[in-house]
């Protein structure tokens, strides 16, 4: 029968007795930077080319048994998970292996850098189809390793890495913390985060998604027909490398940004038990388990968006946090969140010719997060329209006045320390979808975009008194681009998007003694692209 | 012993090819920074990745590496250039004493220096 992990990543339409999705990634080359491998194993024979690249440190001490089968274990298993004949994800993908880890499973940042450079030079000498680089390794945060990954990603290479096995914030490790890399955490057959000894999978905002990583059957280097189960975030990353190979084989022109958005879009949502993560990391950690798309073609008409959290600002009075989208994504909205509720909102601003989302801490606050909604919107022309604080009782308003521009997101930023002491604004009158409304003491920023066939609508859900959380979701066929709260009073901790749902968090009235007149409304802006839908219909 | 002789030979050549070694001072107002792994047991002191500014050419990387060797030799330190990077990042990998970091950070074209550290199978 099909192993649990392959079943988990397979959409129901392919589930038969055997795992045999269409096109096994045959147009894609996957580079594996790991231990040596047993290339004559029946699972991977003829599929993996061992390059002459080797850069490994000496093993510690003298207690190493350097028989090939002992040194090849980790790499052989991962090669099998990516492209193995029987237990592989992308059975058609060809692989190339580079040895950067010794018999102990230990390597160096410098050896990994030289390996990445080798891949780049090979790509320049002999350009092939799409390339995926699997980095099933982790070290401490490294500026230089992250920089090298960024350069390789900008050269069109898809990098996939393990989040790390240290039950810790993945942002403290490299290459897991590199924004351009697809970072993968591990879950088990029960969709629980994987526990490994006393530790387990890493988590946090630097993780893009999770994938099966416990009790994964794959090639064993003990003999050429042997199989073994292994666990770890390396195994999870190998699944995503395989899925990426399949997607790229079906659509070789996909950019890294498009691939990442598709991986997120087709993942299983909200199946992970978040109680396993530390409380302060739950909101930052994506509740996504990787899966193959139900159809390898025809996803192009979707408007894809993802949520990007910034690093924490820190607690100083003027501290700010910045969330950035990838180079070929559009920032369609910007929001902020603070656990203490002490914040001064957020704004979209230009930085290096690109819009970024900046959140502002307030005096006495423990710090803030900026939350960017990053979308794939071809031929988009987006700008930010700002209205300064109105000071009048009706609140501050701003709308998209340019012809053909639609509202994709609203942000508000204020200088006063505590909006809660000021009278809340009147809610926006209905029937004005292109307008942002906020507190009269706040400046309001509207994200206005023009793109072929782009249409958006505003959806609201309000409750009379804050209950901790208010949500509003976009319906099928629409994508959440903006998420904000009305009003911006101090009991609102912030707003953020989770998949297609806008979440507004506030302090519970029972703990704050707020009055019931302080209604909290979650405001979602839902968009779709008729142009993308038509384009995909014309292709079919 | 063989390795050491090789290093020494390399240093002598470097000394002959460099004049003062201070001809190109780093650009005014830009300070190169030093980085190292936050996890002590994972650190590998004695090996450093010297990362040069983005548009630095291979020839400048090689020249900067030779300059470091020459200046180190003048102070009685042996260094070994293990690899010159180009294609992804400009820079070089050098085996040297940590005492030379201050000197290396002042070299022209240097953006930052990172002490090597371990990575592990996951």
């Amino acid at each position: 029968s099909i192993p649990w992990n392959l079943e988990r990543i397979t959409p129901p339409r392919y589930r038969a007795d055997e795992y045999q999705p269409p096109d096994g990634g045959s147009l894609v080359e996957v580079y594996l930077l790991d231990t040596s491998i047993q290339s004559d194993h029946r699972e991977i024979e003829g599929r993996v080319m061992v390059t002459d690249f080797e850069n490994v440190p000496e093993e510690d001490g003298t207690r190493f048994h350097r028989q090939a089968s002992k040194c090849d274990s980790h790499g052989t298993h991962l090669a099998g998970v990516v492209s193995g004949r029987d237990a592989g994800v992308a059975k058609g993908a060809s692989m190339r292996s580079l040895r950067v880890l010794n018999c102990q499973g230990k390597g160096t940042v410098s050896g990994t850098l030289i390996g990445l450079e080798f891949i780049r030079k090979s790509q320049l000498v002999q350009p092939v189809g799409p390339l995926v680089v699997l980095l099933p390794l982790a070290g401490g945060y490294s500026r230089v390793l992250n920089a090298a990954c960024q350069r390789l990603a900008r050269a069109g290479v898809v990098l996939v890495t393990a989040a790390g096995n240290f039950r810790d914030d993945a942002c403290l490790y490299s290459p897991a913390s590199a924004p351009e890399v697809i970072t993968v955490g591990a879950t088990n057959a029960q969709d629980q985060p994987v526990t490994l000894g006393t530790l387990g999978t890493n988590f946090g905002r630097c993780v893009d998604l999770f994938a099966p990583g416990e009790d994964i059957i794959g090639a064993s280097s003990d003999c050429s027909t042997c199989f073994v189960s292994q666990s770890g975030t390396s195994q999870a990353a190998a699944h995503v490398a395989g899925i990426a190979a399949m997607m790229l084989s079906a659509e070789p022109e996909l950019t890294l940004a498009e691939l990442r958005q598709r991986l997120i879009h087709f993942s299983a949502k909200d199946v992970i038990n978040e109680a396993w993560f530390p409380e302060d990391q739950r909101v930052l950690t994506p509740n996504l388990v990787a899966a193959l798309p139900p159809s390898t073609h025809g996803a192009g008409w979707q408007l894809f968006c993802r949520t990007v959290w910034s690093a924490h600002s820190g607690p100083t009075r003027m501290a700010t946090a910045i969330a950035r989208c990838a180079p070929d994504e559009e920032l369609l909205s910007c929001s902020s969140f603070s656990r203490s509720g002490k914040r001064r909102g957020e704004r979209m601003e230009a930085q290096g010719g690109k819009l970024v989302c900046r959140a502002h801490n307030a005096f006495g606050g423990e710090g803030v997060y900026a939350i960017a909604r990053c979308c794939l919107l071809p031929q988009a022309n987006c700008s930010v329209h700002t209205a300064p604080p109105a000071e009048a009782s009706m609140g501050t308003r701003v709308h998209c006045h340019q012809q053909g521009h639609v509202l994709t997101g609203c942000s508000s930023h204020w200088e006063v320390e505590d909006l809660g002491t000021h009278k809340p604004p009147v809610l926006r009158p209905r029937g004005q979808p292109n307008q942002c409304v906020g507190h009269r003491e706040a400046s309001i920023h509207a994200s206005c975009c023009h793109a072929p066939g782009l249409e958006c609508k505003v959806k609201e859900h309000g409750i009379p008194a804050p209950q901790g959380q208010v949500t509003v979701a976009c319906e099928e066929g629409w994508t959440l681009t903006g998420c904000s709260a009305l009003p911006g009073t101090s009991h609102v901790l912030g707003a953020y998007a989770v998949d297609n749902t806008c979440v507004v968090r506030s302090r519970d009235v029972s703990t704050t003694g707020s009055t019931s007149e302080e209604a909290v409304t979650a405001v979602a802006i839902c968009c779709r692209s008729r142009h993308l839908a038509q384009a995909s219909q014309e292709l079919q | 012993q063989e390795d050491e002789d090789g290093d020494y030979e390399e240093l002598v050549l470097a000394l002959r090819s460099e004049e003062d070694g201070l001809a190109e001072a780093p650009e005014h107002g830009t300070t190169a920074t030093f980085h190292r792994c936050a996890k002590d047991p994972w650190r590998l002191p004695g090996t450093y990745v010297v990362v040069l500014k983005e548009e630095t050419h291979l020839s400048q990387s090689e020249r900067t590496a030779r300059r470091l060797q020459a200046q180190a030799a003048r102070r009685g330190y042996l260094t070994k250039i293990l690899h010159v990077f180009h294609g992804l990042l400009p820079g070089f990998l050098v085996k040297m004493s940590g005492d030379l970091l201050e000197l290396a950070l002042k070299l022209p074209h240097v953006d930052y220096i990172e002490e090597d550290s371990s990575v592990f199978a996951q």
Epitope: H65, C103, S220, V228, Q230 | A121
Partner: antibody, heavy 123, light 112 residues
């Protein structure tokens, strides 16, 4: 249920040999380093030996080096300790214990232990 | 003699707080390697009590806590209970021995 069960203990004469086994179940055995720890009667715990997940690394306490050999069979989910040239001071309860193989990035705690098997070396 | 040094015994009355120290050197605790603590009740196998200096596995009461500083570590038990009477061991990794090391163990007696 995660479980380790030791077997193979018994009475043996000084200079004799014994092979201990540890059967593992309920977890991905081949991702874990395995260890032998002993406890002489009325004494404390003493680490004896460890083996990495793929058997690439074997480590021994000085007191047993050259006499004991640790091994494992991942296909059988089993750990072994071959004890030769046994001495009276090797008399102890021998426990097997697991720790996840972090490839020397981290040395984890022994989070699961067997119930132990008694080895008596006496003439 | 053990590489890690623990007091042979400590005692306290029910409800009291006791601490057990574990002193190592620059090749184990001082080298940045974590300290783990085990509880061994009479006639049973050791049970993990604290991992990674201060982390409690699920099921371990929050009366038990661990800390580490420099070349030593300590285990604190608050609100002593009769069932806490056991032997307690610290453990770390030693780079010069390339292996694990245990403390000699501390017998905790709950008075009364």
């Amino acid at each position: 249920e995660v479980q380790l069960v030791e077997s193979g203990g018994g009475l043996v004469k000084p200079g004799g040999s014994l092979r201990l086994s540890c059967a593992a179940s309920g977890f991905t055995f081949s991702s874990y380093s395995m260890n032998w720890v002993r406890q002489a009667p009325g004494k404390g715990l003493e680490w004896v030996s460890s083996i990495s997940s793929s058997s690439s690394y074997h480590s021994y306490a000085d007191s047993v080096k050259g006499r004991f050999t640790i091994s494992r069979d991942n296909a059988k989910n089993s750990l072994y300790l071959q004890m030769n040239s046994l001495r009276a001071e090797d008399t102890a309860v021998y426990f097997c214990a697991r720790d996840y193989d972090f490839h020397s990035a981290y040395h984890d705690a022994f989070d699961v232990w067997g119930q132990g098997t008694m080895v008596t070396v006496s003439s | 003699e053990s590489v890690l040094t623990q007091p042979p015994s400590v005692s306290g009355a029910p409800g009291q707080r006791v601490t057990i120290s574990c002193t190592g050197s620059s090749s184990n605790i001082g080298a940045g390697y974590d300290v783990h603590w085990y509880q061994q009740l009479p006639g049973t196998a050791p049970k993990l009590l604290i991992s990674g200096n201060s982390n409690r596995p699920s099921g371990v009461p929050d009366r038990f806590s661990g800390s580490k500083s420099g070349t030593s570590a300590s285990l604190a038990i608050t609100g002593l209970q009769a069932e806490d009477e056991a032997d307690y061991y610290c453990q770390s990794y030693d780079s010069s021995l390339s292996g694990s090391v245990f403390g000699g163990g501390t017998k905790l007696t709950v008075l009364g």
